[in-house]
């Protein structure tokens, strides 16, 4: 049985992650985790220098 791609990539979409669709990729820790352990990225106000929240790459299949 051949495996299909883990995620579909659009022209400007992020690179496919090593995670199964059930999980999300933690960009800071560089590994897969349950999506609920990640915070949704929020736009930073201009000039803000606080560290960015943990974010996930998880394109829909």
């Amino acid at each position: 049985m051949r495996r299909g791609p883990r995620s579909l990539r659009g022209r400007d979409a992020p690179a496919p992650t090593p995670c199964v669709p059930a999980e999300c990729f933690d960009l800071l820790a560089r590994h897969c985790v349950a999506c609920g352990l990640l915070r949704t990225p929020r736009p930073k106000p201009a000039g803000a220098s606080s560290p960015a929240p943990r974010t996930a790459l998880q394109p829909q299949e």
Partner: antibody, heavy 118, light 113 residues
Framework: EVKLVESGGGLVQPGGSLRLSCAIS????????MSWVRQPPGKALEWLGF??????????EYNPSVKGRFTISRDNSQSIFYLQMNTLRAEDSATYYC?????????WGQGTTVTVSA | DIVMSQSPSSLAVSVGEKVTMSCKSS????????????LAWYQQKPGQSPKLLIY???TRESGVPDRFTGSGSGTDFTLTISSVKAEDLAVYYC?????????FGGGTKLEIK
């Protein structure tokens, strides 16, 4: 066709150990997460944990209810993965299922029964 | 841990009837970055292992009849069987995979009159 076959269940005394096996066929073993779930007689399902795939270094996640007593591992050369259960208690009596994780718990084996009793 | 609550615990219906069952989670299962709800539904027929019916709350698994429909978002979810068949006799479980540990509901037992 995806096929998962559990084995290793049986009767064990409280405090004893048991290792369950899940033989895998029909897909590339190293490319999938594999999970264990149990179901006490007449009761609901309980997720025990999973082991990730090769791309993720075969890392594991466990349910805190069994962490430290149960260990999930895999032997990719033989397409088998394991659940090592130590310090077993009466409440560990259940049917134990292995399942392939992708979108959720996609494919399940038929289960193997563990009875913990003196 | 996220607590999953299913209702009713059992129900009896006639063949051809429409059935709805509920699953509620103690916290939202919606990941807003991709708008996915990390909720699955499983069917367990007597003496068999569970089978995945629905994932991401509303996506039907390949091969599952279209009479099975999952809906809902956040904390409230529903599994609907549009026209029950005798072969649908089973226990139906919802499960969250939004965070660890993954947790299941107590199940809804569907009986056929």
């Amino acid at each position: 066709e995806v096929k998962l076959v559990e084995s290793g269940g049986g009767l064990v005394q409280p405090g004893g150990s048991l290792r369950l096996s899940c033989a895998i066929s029909g897909f590339t073993v190293t490319a999938y997460y594999m999970s264990w779930v149990r179901q006490p007689p007449g009761k609901a399902l309980e997720w025990l944990g999973f082991i990730r795939d090769k791309a993720n270094g075969y890392t594991t996640e466990y349910n805190p209810s069994v962490k430290g007593r149960f260990t999930i591992s895999r032997d990719n050369s033989q397409s088998i993965f394991y659940l090592q259960m130590n310090t077993l208690r009466a409440e560990d009596s259940a049917t134990y299922y292995c399942a392939q994780v992708r979108r959720a718990l996609d494919y399940w084996g038929q289960g193997t029964t563990v009875t913990v009793s003196a | 841990d996220i607590v999953m609550s299913q209702s009713p615990s059992s129900l009896a219906v006639s063949v051809g009837e429409k059935v709805t069952m509920s699953c509620k989670s103690s916290q939202s299962l919606l990941y807003s970055s991709n708008q996915n709800n990390y909720l699955a539904w499983y069917q367990q027929k007597p003496g068999q292992s569970p089978k995945l019916l629905i994932y991401w709350a509303s996506t039907r698994e390949s091969g599952v009849p279209d009479r099975f429909t999952g809906s809902g978002s956040g904390t409230d979810f529903t599994l609907t069987i549009s026209s029950v068949k005798a072969e649908d006799l089973a226990v139906y479980y919802c499960q969250q995979y939004y965070t660890y540990p993954y947790t299941f509901g107590g199940g809804t037992k569907l009986e056929i009159k």
